[in-house]
């Protein structure tokens, strides 16, 4: 389809991307799937400016982003290179902590109450943010 010129209803435009902020919680895999159903992806943070934008909209609430290490190395869901890209981890994070008693470590990244990142158990029901790039989106709005 042709490129989208503006964001769908209830999405927020910022720097040629559209963002949707959930108000309920889901496990990381469900949040990831929701964004894909909407022809989007969990938010990929590529700069301090984008970090501040997202942080402003989510407030001091644990919120999933599109970063995980479920298959070994840390990966962004859209293929953005993790090693050379922007990072904003809390001190001592990620730590793949096993002491939570839920089985396994911590493989999914989220914004914490101060905006910095932490790795946590992917099954926790956190809010999430979807992102889609205007230049990549099709003309039709996502299914609602």
């Amino acid at each position: 389809g042709s490129e989208r010129t503006c964001c769908p209803v209830n999405w927020v435009e910022h720097e040629r991307s559209c963002y949707w902020f959930s108000r309920s919680g889901k496990a990381w895999a469900d949040a990831d799937n929701y964004c894909r159903l909407e022809d989007a992806h969990l938010v990929v943070v590529t700069s301090w400016e984008e970090q501040k934008f997202v942080q402003h909209h989510i407030g001091p609430v644990n919120t999933w982003m599109g970063l995980h290490d479920q298959n070994g190395p840390w990966k962004w869901v859209d293929g953005t290179d993790y090693e050379t890209g922007f990072k904003n981890w809390r001190p001592e994070q990620p730590d793949d902590w096993y002491g939570h008693g839920l089985g396994g470590g911590e493989d999914c990244a989220h914004f914490t109450d101060d905006g910095r990142w932490n790795d946590d158990v992917c099954q926790r029901p956190y809010r999430w943010v979807c992102e889609t790039e205007l230049d990549k989106a099709s003309q039709e709005p996502p299914l609602l």
Partner: antibody, heavy 122, light 107 residues
């Protein structure tokens, strides 16, 4: 009436790939999600993934990531599922099933294809 | 992943019997549950969605109930064409998962 008609049975060697088709009729193909489900001989049902025909967007179960490719041709209202690096464990009947039209009903199936038997044997 | 556990795995019943099949989810799925019927060599047929809503064309002797983690499929008066395997499926969480099936056989 809604119909999902699948391609015929296939016999493949281990390591090969198979591509199964599912031709939809009787409804607007781009208005509903399409799913793929498989069933090994004498076993239960196993969900593989979905495709959104309108955009071509997909998602699949982690078990199949990197091995399954779901595509569609809107001009012929046909969905395709390709599974690569086949092993004997992939011997199964593969079904397409129509999902819902929205992000809240995406996982609700109403119509199923007749199934395609894929046999993997050396 | 959410595990779906069906019981019994098989049962024998007679025409006219009331048959009840249960399905338990490993976590709360609200009413995001469907039931399917499958006969040997055939594709599954959708019976019930949203735990209790009948798919179009499904006889009213089939009914579903439950919410949260515990669900039931009831056939009020078993007919000869109802001898089949029945599956539940949760459609709440990714990935979608099915129960192991319940085979309803002739007594």
């Amino acid at each position: 009436q809604v119909q999902l008609v699948q391609s015929g049975a296939e016999v493949k060697k281990p390591g090969a790939s198979v591509k199964v088709s599912c031709k939809a009729s009787g409804y607007t193909f781009t208005g509903y999600f399409m799913h793929w489900v498989r069933q090994a001989p004498g076993q239960g049902l196993e969900w593989m993934g979905w495709i959104k025909p309108k955009s071509g967007g997909t998602n699949c179960a982690q078990k199949f990531q990197g091995r399954v490719t779901m595509t569609r041709d809107t001009s012929s209202s046909t969905a395709y599922m390709e599974l690569s690096r086949l092993t004997s464990d992939d011997t199964a009947v593969y079904y397409c099933a129509r999902g819902g039209a929205t992000v809240t009903t995406w996982g609700v199936f109403d119509y199923w294809g007749q199934g395609t038997l894929v046999t993997v044997s050396s | 992943d959410i595990q779906m556990t069906q019981s019994p795995s098989s049962l024998a019943a007679s025409v006219g019997d009331r048959v009840t099949i249960t399905c338990r989810a490993s976590q709360d799925i609200s009413n995001y549950l469907a039931w399917f019927q499958q006969k040997p060599g055939k594709a599954p047929k959708s019976l019930i969605y949203a735990a209790s809503s009948l798919q179009s064309g499904v006889p009213s002797r089939f009914s579903g109930s439950g919410s949260g983690t515990d669900f039931t499929l009831t056939i009020s008066s078993l007919q000869p064409e109802d001898f089949a395997t029945y599956y539940c499926q949760q459609c709440d969480s990714f990935p979608l998962t099915f129960g192991g099936g319940t085979k309803v056989e002739i007594k």
